[in-house]
Structure formats: structure tokens, C-alpha cells
């Protein structure tokens, strides 16, 4: 069964800067990746970035840089201040779509006990939804 993992890290140099990394563990080609915060995409979450493997990348503040790391993983750097700044308990969600086969989504947040800049290696997160 395909799985999605999400890793959230606060940068030691900038406490208002977060790095979100997401990956897809499964076979099949990815047609779109959507990163959101505040909840799952389409269910109350706010879209931060959308990555298409061929047509490019779109991102919205406070997203600073979204990029593909591999064919099945992405990273997103967020920085903000004031109302647009993420906080330590913010939930980030990544959705990997493979049209028309299905989509898989998982969410994660900063580990409560983690120090800035330190985090455990990514582990598969529960699948919230699969079409």
C-alpha cells in the first residue's frame, strides 16, 4: 500500500523559518503534489505550494522555495512574520496525486520536544485519505 511521509523542521538560524519535506512511498507516477497548512488540502487547509512534475511549481506566501528533491519527494521552505508566520504546532499536509489512479495524503507538525534544526529521519505517516 502506498504511503506518504511528512517531516517538519524548524531552522536553527531562523526560528520563523520551517522546512517541510514530503515523500511518496509507492509505485506509480505522481501527477501533482499539493502542500497545505492548517489541515488537509480541500478540507480547511490553506494551499502553500503545488508542484507538477512537468509544468512547474506554484507557491503562495509564506512559502519561499518549493522544489522537487526526487521524482517522489519534495521540500518546501517557509518563512514568515506576524500573521503569516507558522508556529510550532502548525499542521502541514502533503498530498500526492496520481491521476486517475488515486491520491494519498498525510500530515505532520514539528515534534513537540525537538530542538531547532534537529529532527528524526522521516518515517511514514498515517494515510489520511486514499481515493
Amino acid at each position: 500500500t502506498p504511503e506518504v511521509w511528512v517531516q517538519v523542521r524548524m531552522e536553527a538560524t531562523e526560528l520563523s523559518s520551517f522546512t517541510i519535506r514530503c515523500g511518496f512511498l509507492g509505485s506509480g507516477s505522481i501527477s501533482l503534489v499539493t502542500v497545505s497548512w492548517g489541515g488537509p488540502n480541500g478540507a480547511g487547509g490553506t494551499t502553500l505550494a503545488v508542484l507538477h512534475p512537468e509544468r512547474g511549481i506554484r507557491q503562495w506566501a509564506p512559502a519561499r522555495q518549493a522544489r522537487w528533491e526526487t521524482q517522489s519527494s519534495i521540500s518546501l521552505i517557509l518563512e514568515g512574520s506576524g500573521a503569516s508566520s507558522p508556529c510550532a504546532n502548525t499542521t502541514f499536509c502533503c498530498k500526492f496525486a496520481s491521476f486517475p489512479e488515486g491520491s494519498w495524503e498525510a500530515c505532520g507538525s514539528l515534534p513537540p520536544s525537538s530542538d531547532p534544526g534537529l529532527s528524526a529521519p522521516p518515517t511514514p505517516a498515517p494515510i489520511l485519505r486514499a481515493d
Epitope: 480541500g42 503545488v50 498530498k95
Partner: nanobody, 120 residues
């Protein structure tokens, strides 16, 4: 949870008409576009038509003048009126909502699909 449910597919003779409907529910935000893709037997996916957030409809060349896409915001529904149908229109038709990349509507969510068969 986002749900897109298509209906209106079926068997029709060449030159005939069909109207596909898509009922959307569970969305709490606006995407860039909503439209229809199709996949003919043994073929790849093709974007048929979509409506941008600005309300402008866009069509693939092969259906221009024959297909009309429309929305009913009050009913949260999308429609595809298909006239002068041809055998090459035979496909599974998917209702999609997605994000714009140029003139392309990249599917983020979609329905289960409805089969359209054009045959005499």
C-alpha cells in the same frame, strides 16, 4: 472529504448528444479551475475542457464548437454538454478540480468517471 460525482454517461449514436453532470461537495476553498478530462480505451488522458476561476471556458481543439462546459455555483455543479458526438469521443470522462499551470488545469481531485460510448 472532497467528493466529485459524475453522471450522464451512456451509449449514444454518432451525431447524438449527451450532457454530463458533476456534483461537487466537501470543498472549503477555491481552486483555480474545474473541468473534464477523458481517457479513451487504450489511450492516454486528455484535458477536454475547463473553466478558470475567472469564468472563462477553455476547450481542446478537437471538441471546439461541439462541447460546452458550464457551472452552476448555486448547485456546486459542473456540466459538459456534448453535441455532434463522434466515435473518437468514446472514453471515460472525469470531472476534476485543480490548479492552473498556463492553460493546463492540473487535477488535484477527481470523480470516479462516467463512460461515454459513441457507436451505431
Amino acid at each position: 472529504e472532497v467528493q466529485l460525482v459524475e453522471s450522464g454517461g451512456g451509449l449514444v449514436q454518432p451525431g447524438g448528444s449527451l450532457r454530463l453532470s458533476c456534483a461537487a461537495s466537501g470543498y472549503t476553498f477555491s481552486t483555480d479551475c474545474m473541468g473534464w478530462f477523458r481517457q479513451a480505451p487504450g489511450k492516454g488522458l486528455e484535458g477536454v475542457a475547463h473553466i478558470d476561476s475567472d469564468g472563462i471556458p477553455r476547450y481542446v481543439e478537437s471538441v471546439k464548437g461541439r462541447f460546452t462546459i458550464s457551472q452552476d455555483h448555486a448547485k456546486n455543479s459542473l456540466y459538459l454538454q456534448m453535441n455532434s458526438l463522434r466515435a473518437e469521443d468514446t472514453a471515460v470522462y472525469y470531472c476534476v478540480v485543480g490548479f492552473k499551470f498556463g492553460d493546463y488545469c492540473a487535477p488535484n481531485d477527481w470523480g470516479q468517471g462516467t463512460m461515454v460510448t459513441v457507436s451505431s
